[in-house]
């Protein structure tokens, strides 16, 4: 038997993926464990094998279909179980009634690109990936810019309280290298959280014209 504190957390990406992390103090690394998904109103079940990500935590993705297919709705409830092999039997280690649209975490924004860059400003655009059409425009974004000599954690957060897939960064220093990241969150869902940060986009402001006041 496995003793200790257990935590089982899952998020729905709003389309066809439920990502789960199970942590259990004192669990055995070489035990085979599965996450089992049992929807209340669908004809499919889905499993994924939990793989170790640290000493006491495991993760897997329940892939419900093609990436952009809408596999669950706001009324669905999915019973999620962690089952681990004990000899020839399988023991339920954790269970939750999962409401997908109350536990959202979207994919990181993609396709970041510089639309226009000047000496002091830069216009950047991006796209959201695998986001449900149910949200319509009910999304918000956070962005941050990495300046020379600073860390991402020190970068101030810029909040876009609407579905706006671009930003104009102002008051930048001429001829300077920057990096930019953005993340997205639906407004819906009691336990909804921010997406991962996008891959950073590197850009450089244009140098100031010679003889001009900067």
């Amino acid at each position: 038997a496995v003793n200790g504190t257990s935590q089982f957390t899952c998020f729905y990406n709003s389309r066809a993926n439920i990502s789960c992390v199970w942590s259990q103090d004192g669990a055995l690394q070489d035990t085979s464990c599965q996450v089992h998904a049992w929807p209340d109103r669908r004809r499919w079940n889905q499993t994924c094998e939990l793989l170790p990500v640290s000493q006491a935590s495991w993760a897997c993705n329940l892939i419900l279909g093609a990436p952009d297919s809408q596999k669950l709705t706001t009324v669905d409830i999915v019973t999620l179980r962690v089952l681990c092999r004990e000899g020839v039997r399988w023991r339920v280690m954790a269970i939750q009634d999962f409401k997908p649209f109350e536990n959202l975490r979207l994919m990181a924004p993609i396709s970041l690109q510089v639309v226009h860059v000047e000496t002091h400003r830069c216009n950047i655009s991006w796209e959201i990936s695998q986001a449900s059409h149910y949200f319509e425009r009910h999304l918000e974004f956070e962005a941050r810019t990495l300046s020379p000599g600073h860390t991402w954690e020190e970068a101030p957060l810029l909040t876009l309280k609407q579905k706006q897939e671009w930003i104009c960064l102002e008051t930048l220093t001429p001829d300077t290298q920057y990096e930019f990241q953005v993340r997205v969150k639906p407004l819906q869902g009691e336990f909804t959280t921010w997406s991962p940060w996008s891959q950073p986009l590197a850009f450089r402001t244009k140098p100031a014209a010679l003889g001009k006041d900067t």
Epitope: S32, N45, T47, E49, I63, L64
Partner: nanobody, 123 residues
Framework: QVQLVESGGGLVQAGGSLRLSCVVS????????MAWFRQAPGKEREFVAV????????EYVDSVKGRFTVSRDNAKNTVYLQMNNLKPEDTAVYYC????????????????WGQGTQVTVSS
């Protein structure tokens, strides 16, 4: 709908080897737990081996343990059954099976199936 196509069967002498392949199309391959079954003439279809979605865990029927190895290549949408030290009693049609539910795949009812490939082991 998911489609499965097996290949690699044939006639082999006892003690020989064969490698079966099963290519999956029509859906996201990594959704599926994959298994091999076999059916000898006049007998029921029996479970041979299973491999989880990640490929990390495999299981076998006792009669093939140590001789057969199941594996998968998620980049190629393919599952394999490497069969060594074949015996005449391994003669059967070998079927590839797919199920999104690991816990259902051994019961044949809800699986997706290939058309099968004949393996004949002569003594």
């Amino acid at each position: 709908q998911v489609q499965l196509v097996e290949s690699g069967g044939g006639l082999v002498q006892a003690g020989g080897s064969l490698r079966l392949s099963c290519v999956v199309s029509g859906d996201v391959f990594v959704r599926y737990t994959m298994a091999w079954f076999r059916q000898a003439p006049g007998k029921e279809r029996e479970f041979v081996a299973v491999v989880t979605d990640s490929g990390r865990t495999t299981e076998y029927v006792d009669s093939v343990k140590g001789r057969f190895t199941v594996s998968r290549d998620n980049a190629k949408n393919t599952v394999y059954l490497q069969m060594n030290n074949l015996k005449p009693e391994d003669t059967a049609v070998y079927y590839c099976a797919a199920n999104t539910d690991y816990f259902q795949i051994r019961s044949v009812d809800n699986n997706a199936w290939g058309q099968g490939t004949q393996v004949t082991v002569s003594s």
